[in-house]
Amino acid sequence: TLNSVLNSNAIKNLPPPLGGAAGHPGSAVSAAPGILYPGGNKYQTIDNYQPYPCAEDEECGTDEYCASPTRGGDAGVQICLACRKRRKRCMRHAMCCPGNYCKNGICVSSDQNHFRGEIEETITESFGNDHSTLDGYSRRTTLSSKMYHTKGQEGSVCLRSSDCASGLCCARHFWSKICKPVLKEGQVCTKHRRKGSHGLEIFQRCYCGEGLSCRIQKDHHQASNSSRLHTCQRHHHHHHHHHH
């Protein structure tokens, strides 16, 4: 439905888990206007270019990663930073822009042997920051109090995508984060064009699956900017095109 499309985020647009910190910008927008009221929080406007606070990469946009703006900085002041393009230095996969991964400290192009699920669940070190706590929010490598013999299935509560089974990601739904299916080719996805659009929705979509990217649907090019429909589409390389 249009409603669910308008209220769906990409997985990497989670609000910061500030554990009750007042007035953070990651407030929810009503799925049905006039029904949902995020208490005590100001809505964040689309034109707000303030740095977006974060605790982990999943809270940032698809073209961003979470880190301190200065090397060795305090974990408490981490923000979402622009991803690094090919051949730029990196310390972990999330630092590299979509379609790339971190190999030997350099962002290189992803190939068929590197699936996003593997990428997300491997190296997660940061710039020497201590991620143990952030404003009282308990940071865990797995969901504490739960003995996970199997990874989370669809609808299971999660903290990050590595808590979920293969083919699923951890995305916000209502007031929880749950395992949802990674998007397939042709499915509607959400592309955030502006930094200020973070954390606005409470219904989030996963990212597009391996080999896919979130692009404007061809027959929607004429639509207004605010209503452009994005779908998961096969990668098209600039240097050569395959015609079938």
């Epitope: 888990p17 554990g19 009750g20 007042a22 995020p38 308990s138 669809e154 995305a171 929880s176 299916p181």
Partner: antibody
Framework: EVQLVESGGGLVQPGGSLRLSCAAS????????ISWVRQAPGKGLEWVAS???????YYPDSVKGRFTISRDNAKNSLYLQMNSLRAEDTAVYYC???????????WGQGTTVTVSS | EIVLTQSPATLSLSPGERATLSCRAS??????????MNWYQQKPGQAPRLLIY???KQGSGIPARFSGSGSGTDFTLTISSLEPEDFAVYYC?????????FGGGTKVEIK
Amino acid sequence: EVQLVESGGGLVQPGGSLRLSCAASGFTFSSYAISWVRQAPGKGLEWVASVSGWGDTYYPDSVKGRFTISRDNAKNSLYLQMNSLRAEDTAVYYCATSYENYAFDYWGQGTTVTVSS
Amino acid sequence: EIVLTQSPATLSLSPGERATLSCRASESVDDFGISFMNWYQQKPGQAPRLLIYAASKQGSGIPARFSGSGSGTDFTLTISSLEPEDFAVYYCQQSKEVPPTFGGGTKVEIK
């Protein structure tokens, strides 16, 4: 074992106030969403309020501006401050958490609120 | 908001019989590849208990005789063989949209 225990219910006059509490144990309280759901006598269930693990709060139109949900993670406690109470707020109030999945998967035993003159 | 209609209002059956409860939503509760439909059981004087979430997944500690099915707007809770402790009121609930809403309930009583 996840346990939720509500308290604070009672008889209150229309226009009055009441504060409900829910004591949680058996899980990392601060990390999970928790909600209030009520049930009027002989009626069905109605969602009242929720608070996420990151502290955002949510209400339906029926209680917006009158009820306030809050949590004290240090005390593993959830609260519902109810002001400007009406007769139609009479119900058993349950706290429920979304612990293993997105649904209301663990519930307390409930506390009864009666609004009557 | 999404309105859920349960039928029948009352189901009179004997222990050992199969119970089939229906829940119809005013609009689809499917999204993100998940059917956001849940089922709860409530006995007199007790809190509800989650039986099924995501249309067909069993909650923790729920006996295998309880199963859920359906997608879109039509959902079914099936109790394969009624036990004496299964006589109760059953509610469906959607979590696709805010506010989360509940059906009016189906009472399963002893015939």
